[in-house]
């Protein structure tokens, strides 16, 4: 049903919504503060453009008595049970932040007659692609794929002459969140990626991932993974690798690779590590301080939320238009704007765009070094080394399938 | 980042032992690898003994069958334990660690093996 919205005579307000479930187990007063810092930049850029406006946020939290797994797989409900309150408290403001989990945005989205803007830190998976009035700032799924994809096809850089056509995916089930819907996307068999590919499998115990390290009679030599170093040195351990194994490491949002003195543990060598490139300041910035390297982008996402809506709000008040409009609702795409560490890029269905780091492991030096950069907006691959040190013969990446000639 | 302190070192006969001690600021079992290095005077840093937590030990040559590296992950303490020293061990002995992401050295201790 209709819900009144606080978003009008000159006082706008924004609904943040603070589950119990949540992508990441970041304590809400992190994202609150990020959230108030977001608030006074937007105050200032509003009063700079000569705008005598008043911007607030009223922070909505869960009861949590019934919903309390603190992570994603009770969301679902916990998300409508919030908006109902709203609902009930007549406090809808003219955009909602939040909620993270896939299954919540998703079910919040089917659910409710949205006639304004949602902006998530979150719902990665591919069942919130392509929604009219939600928009992504973390990385979805369907970026990562169209990365993968567009990597296994290219055949023409120096360090890699062969396409790839098939992969093992290692997807054991204790994933955080942001892996559980990469990977479940890689796993669809209706995906993209399944579909380029000619041949991938999964790997759901650690003694299957274990053995292919050094099966003769492997599909492929490629296995794609998501989680940090450690998550990888647990499964793996000391054990030998065969030396045409390539294994690819999806960690997105982990700044620590580009930190000062990092040296890559020798189990790193077989393996590229695909990050987001960190933002110019952010790991220095007052913002971050309090954060750990993986928590960054989440908290930094709740603040880029609310200077994207004070950026949509600058355009509207500016043009003379209604914030309380579906135009409104359906604008938080198919723009740039200026984000807490730079210009942030939203693709047509509202997504953020961003550039995906391939890193390797120098055999020379122990330091992870940067073999490529993605722009997910063009889908388009840009080489940085182009003489990398890698382990691989002949310092190229194998092929895919052993024994096979050259594409 | 982790750190690193060493002791035990001293002066020891040729053919005598030491027992050297290397305590962590945090949980050893969370670490990556844990090693002992040594560095004679006028001499390359090398290897002695390393131990990763997945349960790989590694010997230089010159030390097999004579030294023993071990953990105690209560006390998240690594030891060596060296027998039989001849001069040739003669050196300051490093404690190193490194967590998945960082190299920590210790400041090291003095060994002297002489008559």
């Known amino acids: 049903s209709q819900v009144s919205q606080n978003c009008h005579n000159g006082s706008y307000e924004i609904s943040v919504l603070m589950m119990g479930n949540s992508a990441f187990a970041e304590p809400l007063k992190n994202l609150e503060d990020a959230v108030n810092e977001g608030l006074e930049i937007v105050r200032g850029r509003l009063q700079n453009a000569g705008l005598n406006v008043t911007v607030n946020a009223t922070f909505m939290y869960s009861d949590g008595l019934i919903h309390n797994s603190g992570d994603c797989r009770s969301s679902t409900c916990e998300g409508l049970d919030l908006l109902r309150k709203i609902s009930n408290a007549q406090r809808m403001g003219c955009v909602l932040i939040g909620p993270s989990c896939t299954y919540s945005t998703f079910q919040m989205y089917l659910d409710t007659e949205l006639s304004y803007p949602m902006i998530s830190a979150g719902s990665f998976g591919l069942s919130c692609d392509y929604k009219e009035t939600l928009t992504r700032l973390m990385s979805p799924a369907r970026k990562l794929m169209y990365f993968l994809v567009n990597f296994w096809k290219t055949n023409d850089l120096p360090f890699k002459t062969y396409s790839w056509s098939t992969s093992y995916v290692y997807k054991n089930g204790t994933e955080t969140e942001d892996c559980f819907w990469y990977l479940n996307a890689l796993e669809a068999s209706v995906s993209y990626f399944s579909h380029e590919l000619g041949f991938k499998v999964v790997l759901r115990q650690d003694k299957e991932f274990q053995d292919i390290l050094m099966d003769h009679n492997r599909k492929s030599n490629v296995i794609i993974m998501c989680g940090g170093p450690e998550f990888l040195y647990k499964l793996k351990g000391d054990r030998a690798v065969a030396e045409d194994i390539v294994i690819i490491l999806v960690d997105l949002f982990n700044d620590q690779y580009f930190e000062d003195n990092v040296t890559a543990p020798d189990y790193m060598k077989n393996v590229l590590v695909l990050t987001l490139s960190p933002g110019n300041s952010l790991l220095n910035s007052s913002f971050s301080r309090n954060l750990s390297p993986t928590k960054r982008d989440f908290a930094l996402a709740y603040l880029n939320g609310i200077l994207l809506f004070g950026h949509m709000l600058k355009i509207f008040l500016e043009n003379g238009e209604n914030i309380t409009t579906p135009k409104f609702a359906h604008a938080f795409r198919n723009l740039t704007f200026e984000g807490y560490d730079g210009p942030v890029t939203l693709d047509d269905w509202g997504d953020v765009d961003s550039t995906m780091v391939l890193l390797y492991t120098s055999v020379d030096t122990k330091k992870y070094k940067v073999l490529l950069t993605y722009d997910t907006h063009v889908n388009k691959t840009y080489p940085v080394d182009m003489s990398p040190t890698f382990t691989w013969k002949n310092s190229k990446l194998p092929n895919d399938i052993t024994g096979r000639g050259p594409q | 980042e982790v750190q690193l302190v060493e002791s035990g070192g001293g002066l020891v006969q040729p053919g005598g032992s030491l027992r050297l001690s290397c305590a962590a600021s945090?949980?050893?079992?969370?670490?990556?690898?844990v090693d002992w290095y040594r560095q004679a005077p006028g001499k390359q840093r090398e290897l002695v003994a390393g131990?990763?937590?997945?349960?790989?030990?590694t010997y230089a040559d010159a030390v097999k069958g004579r030294f023993t590296i071990s953990t105690d992950n209560v006390k998240d303490t690594v030891y060596l334990q060296m027998n039989s020293l001849t001069p040739e061990d003669t050196a300051v002995y490093y404690c190193?660690?490194?967590?998945?992401?960082?190299?920590?050295w210790g400041q090291g201790t003095q060994v002297t093996v002489s008559s």
């Open positions: 131990s990763t937590s997945g349960g790989t030990t």
């Open positions: 945090r949980n050893i079992f969370s670490l990556y690898r």
């Open positions: 190193h660690a490194h967590d998945h992401w960082r190299d920590s």
